[in-house]
Amino acid sequence: NFMYSKTVKRLSKLQEYQQYYPSLTCVMEGKDMEDWSCCPTPWTSFQSSCYFISTVMQSWTKSQNNCSVMGADLVVINTKEEQDFITQNLKINSAYFLGLSDPKGWRHWQWVDQTPYNKNVTFWHSGEPNSPDERCAIINFRSEEWGWNDVHCHVPQKSICKMKKIYI
């Protein structure tokens, strides 16, 4: 009876999410493997988040709006492990917008989700950021490693969206 009511709840939750995400990929987790954590297909998952790499070339503001429509934000990178996971799926000759910007050019960087900007957990390439006119951050491959660079926000780039996993 307990399992039946849990399944019914899950199905109704799935139906609820289906209007936003036509397909979800779910895995069982939790100590009794009773919880399902899901990401929209074909997003990838890492820890408690889902990631989507957009190959559409758009300005930073348009990229953020595009993520927002999908219930996400441009990616906020909190750890080196998270960055290493993300970069596995990136092309080394491309650049991708992050959810990091400095709209006034005062070198006051801010994450789109209001996560505090911690200078100790940043992965800028050597010599970056280097221009107050370049107010948006990308991740790209340079000098044999992935790192961040400040660029003009209006110049179209690919982008990475991030959202919290859906638990059902």
Partner: antibody, heavy 121, light 111 residues
């Protein structure tokens, strides 16, 4: 006082080339992105190209891509536009303009007086 | 590309009266509190001159009879009390994404 002075315009046959120059004074030229904007008779203003302050970024609309090249010489406080394979539709007054960044975008705060390019056989 | 449509194409206003020019973008040129539309004035035989940046910020040296407002896709330039020297063509411009684009212009004349 900020000044932008364009030169190099003139009459050229279709398929020909011209090099426009813009001499800048009254400001620290190397610190600013610069653009060329044109205005054909009776038409709206049309952006032609942009170059970033550090020369790392250039951008063109499809209408001129592959034919026009923007460049700058910060030592000479000069901006250039090399125009090849010119067409009748390139006929316009060409302005050089200084860019000022504002939040996620930019505007043009100073414009030169313009130089006229006429493409005709 | 973002298309900017200005209205009206031309406007005749009596001296001392209010002139209102509209600019509509084909998609939003705002992001959160940033409204990325700018306005220019162009007199015959002269280059454009910046009046308003960021939808509502008056450029230094521009008389305060000029003002701007709007957000998203709809923006307005207002001349509160038209003076003879305001006879010109007025353009809006966006640069939230490349390529930057301009409106078709509104010609302001004296009635």
């Amino acid at each position: 006082e900020v000044q932008l002075v364009e030169s190099g315009g003139g009459l050229v046959k279709p398929g020909g080339s011209l090099r426009l120059s813009c001499a800048a004074s009254g400001f620290t030229f190397r610190s600013y992105g610069m653009s060329w904007v044109r205005q054909a008779p009776g038409k709206r203003l049309e952006w032609v190209s942009t170059i970033s302050s550090g020369d790392s970024y250039t951008y063109y609309p499809d209408s001129v891509k592959g034919r026009f090249t923007i460049s700058r010489d910060n030592a000479k406080n000069s901006l250039y536009l090399q125009m090849n394979s010119l067409r009748a539709e390139d006929t316009a007054v060409y302005y050089c303009a200084r860019q000022i960044y504002y939040d996620y975008a930019y505007y043009f705060d100073f414009w030169g007086q313009g130089t006229t390019v006429t493409v005709s056989s | 590309d973002i298309v900017l449509t200005q209205s009206p194409d031309s406007l005749a206003v009596s001296l001392g009266e209010r002139a209102t020019i509209n600019c509509r973008a084909s998609e939003s040129v705002s992001f959160r509190t940033s409204h990325l539309m700018h306005w220019y004035q162009q007199k015959p035989g002269q280059p454009p001159k910046l009046l308003i940046y960021g939808a509502s910020n008056l450029e230094s040296g521009v008389p305060d009879r000029f003002s701007g407002s709007g957000s998203g896709t709809d923006f307005t330039l207002t001349i509160s009390s038209l003076q003879a020297e305001d006879v010109a063509v007025y353009f809006c411009q966006q640069s939230i994404e490349d390529p930057p684009t301009f409106g078709g212009g509104t010609k302001v004349e004296i009635k």
